[in-house]
């Protein structure tokens, strides 16, 4: 806490300008009016204040707005935002996308800090849902943002927002997250034609059920191996050799290099060896010819 001291004669700040960088901490405290600072926050960023001086300016704003800063001030915080704690930010009510962008710009190039995470959380909660413009903004600054959300949080994403998602935004998503996102993507892209639909839905297919993969196999889509390897194992297992061949097209040649990895390994174990042989890749481990395959899950359902 800086001691309350009277401002020396002639040092009272009339405006926020470069002369203030020569002020000692106690002089800033005594000579800068908090209301003046609040109205001229946009100037602070252009002045090379030290970290200690910024601490003083933050302290003045905290005194002026103990319940949290108004958005007019927040929007112009600039580098002062880096001085804010998550507790400070929880007091804010940020509704403007421009304000959000301005603050994310300050943190650009760095990993998501607790302050930024709190800011985003406040912003999204204030809006009620993760709309397209917000998602566009957040993924532009943090490509991994979507995958940092829990499945519960993702459930509030409206299908219309899915149009803003780029393939790289889903790189770190796990199957539980894709399970939530895939139905939304399917809904969002439902009016597109076959090949265009596949290009858009491809990144979300890690959440696709077997019946959708079967349907895709009838559409000459030529799914690449990288996408196939990200499919849910339980969705891949029921596919026949013919369906996988149709689904992958020329990419089926890549199965050989992946035969020891999931889901290919588990899928091979479920296929008849003579069916696997038709792929011409020397895949081994299928059910030997002449063996009877019992579907025990079906048997249980009947009893």
């Amino acid at each position: 806490e800086v001691e309350k001291t009277a401002c020396p004669s002639g040092k009272k700040a009339r405006e926020i300008d470069e002369s203030l960088i020569f002020y000692k901490k106690w002089e800033l405290e005594a000579c800068v009016d908090a209301a003046l600072l609040a109205t001229q926050m946009d100037r602070v960023n252009a002045i090379p204040f030290t970290y200690e001086q910024l601490d003083v300016l933050k302290h003045k704003l905290d005194e002026l707005y103990p319940q949290g800063y108004p958005e007019s001030v927040i929007q112009h915080l600039g580098y002062l935002f880096l001085k804010m704690s998550p507790e400070d930010i929880r007091k804010w009510n940020v509704t403007s996308l421009e304000t959000l962008k301005a603050l994310l710009e300050v943190n650009k190039g760095h990993e998501m800090s607790p302050q930024v995470a709190t800011l985003i959380d406040r912003f999204v909660k204030g809006r009620g849902q993760l709309d397209k413009d917000t998602l566009d903004t957040l993924t532009a600054f943090y490509p991994g943002y979507l995958c940092s959300l829990s499945p519960e949080e993702l459930s509030s994403v409206p299908p219309s927002s899915i149009w803003a998602v780029r393939p790289q935004d889903l790189d770190t998503c796990d199957p539980r997250q894709l399970d939530v996102l895939y139905p939304k993507a399917r809904l969002a892209f439902q009016n597109m034609n076959g090949s265009e639909y596949f290009v858009k839905i491809q990144s979300f297919l890690g959440g696709a059920p077997t019946e959708d993969l079967k349907a895709l196999s009838q559409q000459n889509v030529s799914m690449d191996l990288a996408t196939f390897m990200k499919l849910r194992t339980d969705a891949v297992l029921p596919l026949t050799v013919a369906e996988v061949q149709k689904l992958l097209g020329p990419h089926v040649e890549g199965l050989k290099a992946e035969e020891r990895h999931r889901p290919v390994r588990d899928w091979i174990l479920r296929q008849r060896q003579d069916d696997l042989d038709t792929l011409g890749l020397g895949l081994q481990g299928g059910i030997p010819n002449g063996y009877l395959v019992l579907d025990l899950s079906m048997q249980e359902a009947l009893s």
Partner: antibody, heavy 121, light 107 residues
Framework: QVQLQQPGTELVKPGASVKLSCKAS????????MHWVKQRPGQGLEWIGN????????YYNERFRSKATLTVDKSSSTAYMQLSSLTSEDSAVYYC??????????????WGQGTTLTVSS | DIQMTQSPSSLSASLGGKVTITCKAS??????IAWYQHKPGKGPRLLIH???ELQPGIPSRFSGNGSGRDYSFSISNLEPEDIATYYC?????????FGGGTKLEIK
């Protein structure tokens, strides 16, 4: 050891068709797809397409879809490429190649010696 | 399709010297690149696969490097039998594509 045998030369007239062969030995023919590659005089290598020898299913480079037809005869472990409506542009050396599936879609570890096709009247 | 841009198209070097050839892919090929030596009247000979893995029997004078879209291939201690045309091949996609080739001559 693995061998891919191709006839040395073929001389054909413009407008005709030709069927080039590639006889495989030293490995299980139906465990590796067969690929075909073209090299025009003084030019680089160009991938034509490949064929699954087990079910006869081919895939083509779009540029060769209406020019080449790939087939196999499992009983003789031989792959064929038929080239139709021949012009001087088709004069080239044609190679068959077998991939090794160590990673991704596989690189070619065995090649035939190539068949030199000359299209001339 | 993935395009492979190989350079230079030809080069001349002295015996015992070192040469480097580059291939640039039109997209990330995840190190799935092979290098071949091709002499007239023969099929291409595999030298390197997966960017830098030397084929059995290939001398360590041959080496490869790179990642993403940019790859290089070098021959050090050049010998007379290295006179040939060299090609890169991407196999990150089932529709394989070759670089345009580099013809190596000895000064």
């Amino acid at each position: 050891q693995v061998q891919l045998q191709q006839p040395g030369t073929e001389l054909v007239k413009p407008g005709a068709s030709v069927k080039l062969s590639c006889k495989a030995s030293g490995y299980t023919f139906t465990n590796y797809w067969m690929h075909w590659v073209k090299q025009r005089p003084g030019q680089g290598l160009e991938w034509i397409g490949n064929i699954n020898p087990s079910n006869g299913g081919p895939y083509y480079n779009e540029r060769f879809r209406s020019k080449a037809t790939l087939t196999v005869d499992k009983s003789s472990s031989t792959a064929y490429m038929q080239l139709s409506s021949l012009t001087s542009e088709d004069s080239a050396v044609y190679y068959c190649a077998r991939p090794y599936y160590g990673s991704s879609y596989g690189y070619f570890d065995y090649w035939g010696q190539g068949t030199t096709l000359t299209v001339s009247s | 399709d993935i395009q492979m841009t190989q350079s230079p198209s030809s080069l001349s070097a002295s015996l015992g010297g070192k040469v480097t050839i580059t291939c640039k892919a039109s997209q990330d090929i995840n190190k799935y690149i092979a290098w071949y030596q091709h002499k007239p009247g023969k099929g291409p000979r595999l030298l390197i696969h997966y960017t830098s893995e030397l084929q059995p029997g290939i001398p360590s004078r041959f080496s490869g490097n790179g990642s993403g879209r940019d790859y290089s291939f070098s021959i050090s201690n050049l010998e007379p039998e290295d006179i040939a045309t060299y090609y890169c091949l991407q196999y990150a996609n089932p529709l394989r594509t070759f670089g345009g080739g580099t013809k190596l001559e000895i000064k």
